[in-house]
Amino acid sequence: DTEIKVNPPQDFEIVDPGYLGYLYLQWQPPLSLDHFKECTVEYELKYRNIGSETWKTIITKNLHYKDGFDLNKGIEAKIHTLLPWQCTNGSEVQSSWAETTYWISPQGIPETKVQDMDCVYYNWQYLLCSWKPGIGVLLDTNYNLFYWYEGLDHALQCVDYIKADGQNIGCRFPYLEASDYKDFYICVNGSSENKPIRSSYFTFQLQNIVKPLPPVYLTFTRESSCEIKLKWSIPLGPIPARCFDYEIEIREDDTTLVTATVENETYTLKTTNETRQLCFVVRSKVNIYCSDDGIWSEWSDKQCWEGEDLSKKTLLR
């Protein structure tokens, strides 16, 4: 019996289509594959950013795979051919590994890249990113921001920069159609007549950096002799009610009484008849049902009741 062998895939490569971190891994079938024409050959692909402890592993019948990477670091990948046991009348046969790497040749020293990059998706409507210039760069240094997400034909440059002392220090993005729940890729590169500037790459999902507007229309309602219901309305904008968590801060007679996190637009507070003043503020955040992370809104305007017996009426400012 001759031992069944299979070759590794040919021309395994990582292709950068210019999407700022979304890369294509592709390969050609191994030589002599038609010996196994009645058989579906599979490929086991492993890849990671250099420095990562764990490999991502994919088994596929295709000749390509796409995923996002951190272009601040290199990428390494390896692949081999798998012949399932059905093809070999026995155990699975694997080829040797084909390996490849990819990295962007860095220009400039790390200190020249932008510092303290911060992006916020205000009210799930307006994306704004800001940064500080690199350490020790001269005033002639200018930074440019490019972005891409699946759905765009190619990476786009910011068209509305925020400037300070003639330097770009931020970007106001245009309306970003169908851009949430997918990776959003940013590159900030730079130019200077004096020295090369290091590029920086960032990836996030927009729903995870939302900062909502604060809640509005805060009201009090006496429910019973010892309960007051605090109510408010969701902030204006595109975020549905089911996506909010709220944090309430309540002060009774200048003493913090309660801080609470709730999922609805109401909170019932136990009070005593002696309470002379009650104030509360609320802030909102996108919850775990709609995102993996988020930023608390600013606090709402304070709503207070003072000077009258809280038990006598509905309180509405």
Epitope: Q10, D11, E13, I14, Q26, Q28, P29, L31, S32, T100
Partner: antibody, heavy 118, light 107 residues
Framework: QVQLVQSGAEVVKPGASVKLSCKAS????????MSWVRQAPGQGLEWVAT????????YYPESVKGRFTITRDNSTSTLYMEMRSLRSDDTAVYYC???????????WGQGTLVTVSS | DIVMTQSPLSLPTTLGQPVSVSCKAS??????VAWYQQRPGQSPRALIY???YRYSGVPDRFSGSGSGTDFTLTISRVEAEDVAVFFC?????????FGGGTKLEIK
């Protein structure tokens, strides 16, 4: 349908350079390797260069290595071959061809005649 | 380099007859052989890959066989449009190499 349209004929002097192009359509260009093959007048076929789909791998025979450079622009689906230090024995019709998934050449361009003569 | 030796150089035949072209590799190329047809004044056209598999659109009168070092292209019934030069090519290893060609002519 798959089409490979090559640039026009070239007449150059020995020692000169020329760059051929091959515009592809009808398939996902970046997924396929591409080759150049030449045919001297009245002669057989001679493989000249191959490039992988993403451009990471290039292959040449010894006869042209260091003189010929195969490149591709996947954004415009165009294959190129830059030929330097041309000699009279480089006179040939140059064909671009798509490399199929088994490394054979399944589609061919119409050919570009390159004449090297003083 | 792997040398591909084709025979015969010229193949005179009559319409409707079967013909075969031989291609021998100087070393083992497994099944990694393709066959091409080049009609007068035209670009080559792919006929066969992996020694025995026809490309789509290629008439079934064309067939290929062989593995290792010996390969054959067979036309079961020659038609007038088959007048051409036929080339074999190995792609088992770089440099890719072609046979010298076999010219099919009608007597």
């Amino acid at each position: 349908q798959v089409q490979l349209v090559q640039s026009g004929a070239e007449v150059v002097k020995p020692g000169a350079s020329v760059k051929l192009s091959c515009k592809a359509s009808g398939f996902t260009f970046s997924s396929y390797g591409m080759s150049w093959v030449r045919q001297a007048p009245g002669q057989g076929l001679e493989w000249v260069a191959t490039i992988s789909g993403g451009g990471s791998y290039t292959y040449y025979p010894e006869s042209v290595k260091g003189r010929f450079t195969i490149t591709r622009d996947n954004s415009t689906s165009t294959l190129y071959m830059e030929m330097r230090s041309l000699r009279s024995d480089d006179t040939a019709v140059y064909y671009c061809a798509r490399r199929d998934l088994r490394s054979a050449m399944d589609y061919w361009g119409q050919g570009t005649l390159v004449t090297v003569s003083s | 380099d792997i040398v591909m030796t084709q025979s015969p150089l010229s193949l005179p035949t009559t319409l409707g007859q079967p013909v075969s072209v031989s291609c021998k590799a100087s070393q083992n190329v497994d099944i990694n052989v393709a066959w091409y047809q080049q009609r007068p004044g035209q670009s080559p056209r792919a006929l066969i890959y992996s020694a025995s598999y026809r490309y789509s659109g290629v008439p079934d009168r064309f067939s290929g066989s062989g593995s290792g070092t010996d390969f054959t292209l067979t036309i079961s019934r020659v038609e007038a449009e088959d007048v051409a030069v036929f080339f074999c090519q190995q792609y088992n290893a770089y440099p890719l190499t072609f046979g010298g060609g076999t010219k099919l002519e009608i007597k």
